[in-house]
Interface confidence: medium
């Protein structure tokens, strides 16, 4: 609602959505129901699940995955082939600046998709999103000049995130708000899969208690967590099997050494 995506995707890859509302961000609305719905994600060019609150929101909301694909993916009915993103950067590079809810004053950097450059911004210290880097170099390495490799689109390497930054973190709750803690990730494994599989479990902001699974990149396993029904991130699966199928394939063990404890 307060941070809608632009109506055009001229800077997000070659694939134009069929309708302008397909470019809107998922909007859960201000109500408290928990309705599984689907939206078209402009950054991944895929239809994805989200939890709808039951009122208001926007038109980028569908009852079924199929309906979402038919409405927003050009040529979907003809080919029934999953649309490819065409982006060479991790999808979080395209996220808008989000200082979060806390009132700290931390100097951070983000990738600005308008200027195609990494820029300084002020981070409040909690929540926010992953377009948030402690150093200009880190931002440039990941978003401005991503390493071109034969690996699939939108892949990232775990080694990019094991520096002293907060980009991949465990989280703890202070004052009922999830705040980043120090990183605890493996240094001897590369992860070449979906970027959201690197995100910590995020229970969200609502009051429900749903059993969900998240991929723990440190252990290479899917673990249970309680989801409150809204917010959170994409590292959130309804079954362990779905979690493993989505995230496990990206983990490549280093042949020489194990995980550093």
């Amino acid at each position: 609602l307060s941070e809608e995506a632009d109506d055009t995707d001229s800077e997000l890859g070659s694939m134009k959505p069929l309708h302008t509302f397909c470019a809107m961000k998922a909007d859960d609305g201000p109500c408290k129901a928990m309705i599984r719905s689907y939206f078209f994600n402009m950054y991944t060019h895929q239809c994805e699940e989200f939890i709808y609150g039951g009122c208001e929101g926007n038109e980028n909301r569908f009852d079924t995955l199929e309906e979402c694909k038919k409405t927003c993916i050009p040529g979907y009915e003809k080919t029934a082939v999953k649309a490819a993103s065409g982006a060479e950067r991790p999808d979080f590079c395209f996220l808008e600046e989000d200082p979060g809810l806390c009132r700290g004053y931390m100097k951070r950097y983000l990738y600005n998709n308008q200027t195609k450059q990494c820029e300084r911004f002020v981070y409040g210290g909690c929540l926010g999103n992953r377009n948030n880097f402690e150093t200009l170099d880190e931002c440039k390495k990941i978003c401005e000049n991503p390493v071109h490799s034969p690996s699939p689109v939108n892949e990232v390497q775990m080694s990019d995130y094991v520096t002293d930054g907060n980009t991949v973190t465990d989280r703890s709750t202070v004052n009922n708000i999830v705040v980043p803690q120090s990183p605890k990730v493996p240094r001897r494994r590369d992860y070449r899969g979906r970027p959201w599989c690197l995100q910590p479990a995020d229970s969200g902001l609502c009051k429900a208690s749903e059993r969900r699974f998240y991929y723990n990149s440190a252990t290479g396993k899917c673990h249970r967590f309680n989801y409150t029904g809204c917010g959170g991130n994409n590292n959130n699966f309804t079954t362990r099997r779905r979690c493993l199928r989505s995230c496990k394939t990206g983990l490549i063990k280093n042949k020489s050494k194990g995980v550093v404890k």
Epitope: L1, D7, P30, C31, E56
Partner: antibody
Framework: QVQLVESGGGLVQPGGSLRLSCAAS????????MDWVRQAPGKGLEWVSS????????YYADSVKGRFTISRDNSKNTLYLQMNSLRAEDTAVYYC??????????WGQGTLVTVSS | DIELTQPPSVSVAPGQTARISCSGD??????AHWYQQKPGQAPVVVIF???NRPSGIPERFSGSNSGNTATLTISGTQAEDEADYYC?????????FGGGTKLTVLG
């Protein structure tokens, strides 16, 4: 640090016009919905108008519809409220506020508008 | 239109618990947010999404929302908590405020 600074308030006669400005700094202005909220002397908060999203959709309270116009200049990080056909009941402190999701996380200090003959 | 109804005033002795209610037909369905406003100052959010407290807001502030009533609770009320408190929710695409409650800390 996020800062919102209102200006443009003052004394105006009934039927007159006034343009309020709100200068924003410390965040990516274009990414957020922005609102005007007013408070008549000794009274409660009353939402006035919103401008949201990349298409700058606008919303107004019934009490100001057709008389007030909200706008923004993202290149100047500034929010505006053009107030025409002002009435005595429009007398209030006008706050600009940043919309985060479905609540207001930052407010300006307000500017006083007095409509009186 | 949705109307949010708050008591005009609530009084509490220092150290006691103050409860400020906000009722409205749609509050069982919509989230409530709470703001504190001290004289001559802008409002400050103290509770969002019914129960969540921003950093910098003391732990004595808490919120709940059940049935058609949202409640702001201040445990161990202190003199500095004396202020006006407003609930805010959402209706038909726009924000709606309650009429406000003046909290007086006695003594």
């Amino acid at each position: 640090q996020v800062q919102l600074v209102e200006s443009g308030g003052g004394l105006v006669q009934p039927g007159g016009s006034l343009r309020l400005s709100c200068a924003a700094s410390g965040f990516t202005f274009r990414s957020y919905g922005m609102d005007w909220v007013r408070q008549a002397p000794g009274k409660g908060l009353e939402w006035v108008s919103s401008i949201r999203g990349s298409r700058s959709s606008t919303y107004y309270a019934d009490s100001v519809k057709g008389r007030f116009t909200i706008s923004r200049d993202n290149s100047k990080n500034t929010l505006y409220l053009q107030m025409n056909s002002l009435r005595a009941e429009d007398t209030a402190v006008y706050y600009c506020a940043r919309l985060y999701r479905y609540w207001f996380d930052y407010w300006g200090q307000g500017t006083l508008v007095t409509v009186s003959s | 239109d949705i109307e949010l109804t708050q008591p005009p005033s609530v009084s509490v002795a220092p150290g006691q618990t103050a409860r400020i209610s906000c009722s409205g037909d749609n509050l069982r369905k919509y989230y409530a947010h709470w703001y504190q406003q001290k004289p001559g100052q802008a409002p400050v959010v103290v509770i969002f999404y019914d129960v969540n407290r921003p950093s910098g807001i003391p732990e004595r502030f808490s919120g709940s929302n059940s049935g058609n009533t949202a409640t702001l609770t201040i445990s161990g009320t202190q003199a500095e908590d004396e202020a006006d408190y407003y609930c805010q929710s959402w209706w038909d695409g726009v924000p709606v405020f309650g009429g406000g409650t003046k909290l007086t800390v006695l003594g």
